[in-house]
């Protein structure tokens, strides 16, 4: 994991259920340091956009990729459950040229019926020459993308564009977006779960209906728990993430598929070509949208979007902003807790969730959303922990 | 058409539990969450909670986190609610309710419960 | 805690008379995100189970005579039977659904 947000040092990493700081050479050592054990069920993750499986090293105090020699498809749903996927979800594994690594963990196969961690040992050399890719979940797939459509002022999305889009409604209206991560698992904005929408019951989702008039309770998923980010701020609108646990799982179609949750070690570039969708307002004070919609836009630098003329140091690292800043493009009011996702390796990423903004398409005020990188460690954290 | 059915009565000694029944019929079950509600002799309505026959989520109101427990049996599309170390106190008529977003739109019969002994 | 008071707690009225009751909450269930109140009306007859009238504060249920309608935003909601019926004879409770559950007292309606 990226260990941020942490009210540790940087030498530190801080336990979830104490507030504790533990030594870096105490995290995945195989001895449980934090009351609730967090310090040795967090030492996998997947980096970049291959997937390459990475476990802690506490010897090293860093992230190593898993050598190939001997790792089977056992190991991989030990590593996908560590990660909070649930083992039917579970997609595939591949592998990857080990692309210029020096340093290895590599599996002891004598080591006997233990945990997958303590078969790990640190090795220079890995004679496969090739690295564990793992798909944890088949995410980011969709049908051939929309046609190039706007949020504001523009077309409507085609059938199984963004299947990873559903649809948040309380009272029978359309409140927010969301996006679909697993078949449980929605992510949506902190904003749209305030007081008195904390409460599941409020909510229905639905998924793979694109006209509003087609969403009726029958045909929704009831929302099991709702959890805001613990450090969501509603005034700045930093931290702005929440997520919902369906009821029953959904299930998944051409129109109805996750999207991919970022890795670390993945760069986003200013300029990104990025979409977002939603039935948020065409226009500025306008009705939601009965038919769902898509836009291009493109990232904005922090340090451009932090700039006086646009958001004068409003942008924290927990939020990215995305549009442009001539305008007529935007996400808008109805679009909050939706998706903000670039394809990279004919993969689709969420790296946002609608937030804020001034106005909607309005110049030098582009969209603001959550910065989903900086929070994957607290989602699996929560997948995790429901079991 | 959507039923919730009932028995009529039940009869308890004090100190004993009871465990009552709703039986939901004409409609998918699993998805909409149902809710009890005790009406005491000539007085008005009070909430007691809320689960999801799916998940079996629940959440009380605090007033009755110990004295009732919500559970179902999916297979036979049936909500319980468990009554525990009864009193002449819990004497009333016990409903059960569907929630469609945020109202009751079904209602059972209720179910009389006397406690004594 | 969300409190439901109403009033007044029984009236009597003649057939054909039009009956305004009110139900007043200690907090606004006005939802800005939808612009819905989380407000419903039941009735419940002599021996019977409630019966949902009236949601959302305005919307009537399907199968209710269009004589019950409800009004009001925020804190402050009415009940009224423009034209009451021998049939209306019933407790009449507001619940409120922003916070958990409330239901108010109850107001009875008696016809003279």
């Known amino acids: 994991w990226k260990f941020m947000g942490s009210k540790c040092s940087n030498s530190g990493i801080e336990c979830d259920s104490s507030g504790t700081c533990i030594n870096p050479s105490n995290w995945c050592d195989g001895v449980s340091h934090c009351p609730g054990g967090e310090d040795e069920n967090r030492c996998v993750r997947l980096y970049g956009p291959n997937f390459i499986l990475q476990v802690y090293s506490s010897q090293r105090k860093s992230w190593h990729p898993v050598c190939q020699d001997d790792w089977n498809e056992n190991y991989g749903r030990a590593a996908c459950r560590d990660m909070g996927y649930k083992n039917n979800f579970y997609s595939s594994q591949g592998i990857v040229d080990d692309s210029g690594s020096t340093s290895f963990m590599k599996l002891n196969t004598s080591a006997g019926n233990v945990d997958i961690y303590k078969k790990l040992y640190h090795s220079d050399a890995c004679s496969s020459k090739a690295v564990v890719s793992l798909r944890c979940i088949a995410c980011g797939v969709n049908l051939n993308s929309s046609r190039q459509s706007r949020i504001v002022g523009g077309e409507s999305a085609l059938p199984g564009a963004w299947p990873w889009q559903v649809s948040l409604h309380v009272q029978n209206v359309h409140v927010c977006g969301g996006s679909i991560i697993t078949p449980e698992w929605i992510v949506t904005a902190a904003h749209c779960v305030e007081k008195p929408l904390n409460n599941p019951w409020h909510w229905t989702a639905f998924a793979g209906i694109l006209r509003q008039s087609f969403m009726f309770y029958g045909a929704g998923y009831q929302v099991e728990k709702v959890i805001s980010h613990p450090n969501y701020d509603s005034k700045t609108k930093n931290n702005d993430i929440a997520l919902m646990k369906l009821q029953k799982p959904l299930t998944f179609n051409d129109l109805v598929k996750p999207v991919c949750l970022p890795n670390p070690g993945m760069m986003l570039q200013p300029e990104q070509l990025c979409w977002i969708s939603g039935w948020g307002a065409t226009e500025e004070k306008g009705k939601t949208s009965e038919v769902l919609n898509a836009a291009k836009v493109l990232l904005i630098e922090t340090q451009r979007c932090n700039s006086r003329y646009v958001y004068d140091n409003l942008i924290t690292p927990a939020m990215i902003c995305a549009g442009f800043l001539q305008g007529n493009v935007d996400s808008c009011q109805g679009d909050s807790g939706g998706p903000l996702v670039t394809s990279k390796n004919n993969i689709w990423w969420l790296i946002g969730d609608t937030s804020w903004g001034s106005g909607c398409a309005k110049a030098y005020r582009p969209g603001v959303y959550g910065n989903v990188m900086v929070f994957t460690d607290w989602i699996y954290r929560q997948m995790r922990a429901d079991g | 058409q959507v039923q919730l059915q009932q028995p009529g009565a039940e009869l308890v000694k004090p100190g004993a539990s009871v465990k009552l029944s709703c039986k939901a019929s004409?409609?998918?079950?699993?998805?909409?969450?149902m809710h009890w509600v005790r009406q005491r002799p000539g007085q008005g309505l009070e909430w007691i909670g809320i689960?999801?026959?799916?998940?079996?989520?629940?959440n009380y109101n605090e007033k009755f986190k110990s004295k009732a427990s919500l559970t179902v049996d999916k297979s036979s599309s049936t909500a319980y609610m468990q009554l525990s170390s009864l009193t002449s106190e819990d004497s009333a008529v016990y409903y059960c309710a569907r929630l469609l977003w945020d109202y009751f739109d079904y209602w059972g019969q209720g179910t009389t419960l006397t406690v004594s002994s | 805690d969300i409190v439901m008071s109403q009033s007044p707690s029984s009236l009597a009225v003649s057939a054909g008379e039009k009956v305004t009751m009110s139900c007043k909450s200690s907090q606004s269930l006005l939802n800005s995100r939808t612009r819905k109140n989380f407000l419903a009306w039941y009735q419940q007859k002599p021996g019977q189970s409630p019966k949902l009238l009236i949601y959302w504060a305005s919307t009537r249920e399907s199968g209710v005579p269009d004589r019950f309608t409800g009004s009001g935003s925020g804190t402050d909601f009415t009940l009224t039977i423009s034209s009451v019926q021998a049939e209306d004879l019933a407790v009449y409770y507001c619940k409120q659904s922003y916070n958990l559950y409330t239901f108010g007292g109850g107001t009875k309606l008696e016809i003279k």
């Open positions: 689960i999801h026959p799916n998940s079996g989520t629940t």
């Open positions: 004409g409609y998918s079950f699993t998805t909409y969450w």
